[in-house]
């Protein structure tokens, strides 16, 4: 594949990255589908400025993002890793809270009306971001 | 009601140490990250340093990097500031304070005068 | 690292009128622009946060506006309490910054 110079028509780009930002809602393993269909990923926060990009884009809206821990460690859908990584929950959370009545804890994270993180049930349609990295190389074949 | 109180100012010799503290109450001081800001005295404010709630992210300034640490012990409530190096520059007063969603400071401790001369 | 300039330095105002502070970011910064009061002797209080909400507990003769690189905080009514010094600071991206201070004081 060729290596993307520029990113996709609707997608913004910010410091070698390209985001997408849907408007309507799906459950994290389809929003988390979704983006690997369009060889990108749920977007994955490694600092306080991609925090604030993408906070000032989604709004004050609940919107998933590819951090999740249904096998057990929250883990980043890239491989970032967590322990050392970019944190920014909410205040107590994450809580894997099971009072929702849903079945099951919470297990999907993302980002709330004030930009900080939570944990929710990974069925319920949110919005989403999907992220691809510039530099790496597209599953497109290259023009001739 | 939420407080931060600061202790460990003084006078210090220029290149020498001090630690200073920030004692926290009436909030869950577990998951906030903290700040330390600085204010020359007659001039503006500066920040520090920031720590994660869990100690995991720190940033510093440019002018503190390398001299200062930032490091908390939550199981004492309490947010620390390790200055190295100190310099005549350094002499100021020492705010703590709490941080509100990413890089806003809701609650200010009192000061603690930090004065660097020989 | 982002530089934040405020304007004027210093003013003098009456019981009553209206003061505009600005605050110019060197880069965008969104809407992550935070005022501050400050007391001699005391502790900077957030006043706004993200460019126009008013922190819990401030009159609402407080008000801000902008976005990108300019903003403004607005005094309606200035009340005796108002006087002292106000600054902003961008939280878009460490190291945060905060400009230089405007002091406002009784004509």
């Known amino acids: 594949g060729s290596e993307r110079t520029c990113c996709p028509v609707n997608w913004v780009e910010h410091e070698r990255s390209c985001y997408w930002f849907s408007r309507s809602g799906k459950a994290w393993a389809d929003a988390d589908n979704y983006c690997r269909l369009e060889d990108a990923h749920l977007v994955v926060v490694t600092s306080w400025e991609e925090q604030k990009f993408v906070q000032h884009h989604i709004g004050p809206v609940n919107t998933w993002m590819g951090l999740h821990d249904q096998n057990g460690p929250w883990k980043w859908v890239d491989g970032t890793d967590y322990e050392t990584g970019f944190k920014n929950w909410r205040p107590e959370q994450p809580d894997d809270w099971y009072g929702h009545g849903l079945g099951g804890g919470e297990d999907c994270a993302h980002f709330t009306d004030d930009g900080r993180w939570n944990d929710d049930v990974c069925q319920r349609p949110y919005r989403w971001v999907c992220e691809t990295e510039l530099d790496k190389a597209s599953q497109e074949p290259p023009l001739l | 009601q939420v407080q931060l109180v600061e202790s460990g100012g003084g006078v210090v010799q220029p290149g020498r140490s001090l630690r200073l503290s920030c004692a926290a109450s009436?909030?869950?001081?577990?998951?906030?990250?903290m700040h330390w800001v600085r204010q020359a005295p007659g001039k503006g404010l500066e920040w520090m340093a920031v720590?994660?709630?869990?100690?995991?992210?720190?940033y510093y300034a440019d002018s503190v990097k390398g001299r200062f640490t930032i490091s908390r012990d939550n199981s004492k409530n309490t947010l620390y500031l390790q200055m190295h190096s100190l310099r005549a520059e350094d002499t100021a007063v020492y705010y703590c304070?709490?941080?509100?969603?990413?890089?806003?400071?809701?609650?200010w401790g009192q000061g603690t005068l930090v004065t660097v001369s020989s | 690292d982002i530089q934040m300039t405020q304007s004027p330095s210093s003013l003098s105002a009456s019981v009553g009128d209206r003061v505009t502070i600005t605050c110019r970011a060197s880069q965008n910064i969104y809407s992550y622009l935070n005022w501050y009061q400050q007391k001699p002797g005391r502790a900077p209080k957030l006043v706004i946060y993200?460019?126009?909400s008013l922190q819990s507990g401030v009159p609402s003769r407080f008000s801000g506006s902008g976005s990108g690189t300019d903003f403004s905080l607005t005094i309606s009514n200035l009340q005796p309490e108002d006087f002292s010094t106000y600054y902003c600071q961008q939280s878009y991206s460490p190291p945060l910054t905060f400009g230089g201070g405007t002091k406002v004081e009784i004509r």
């Open positions: 009436g909030f869950n001081f577990s998951s906030y990250g």
């Open positions: 720590i994660w709630y869990d100690g995991s992210n720190k």
């Open positions: 304070a709490r941080d509100e969603r990413l890089g806003i400071f809701d609650y």
């Open positions: 993200s460019t126009s």
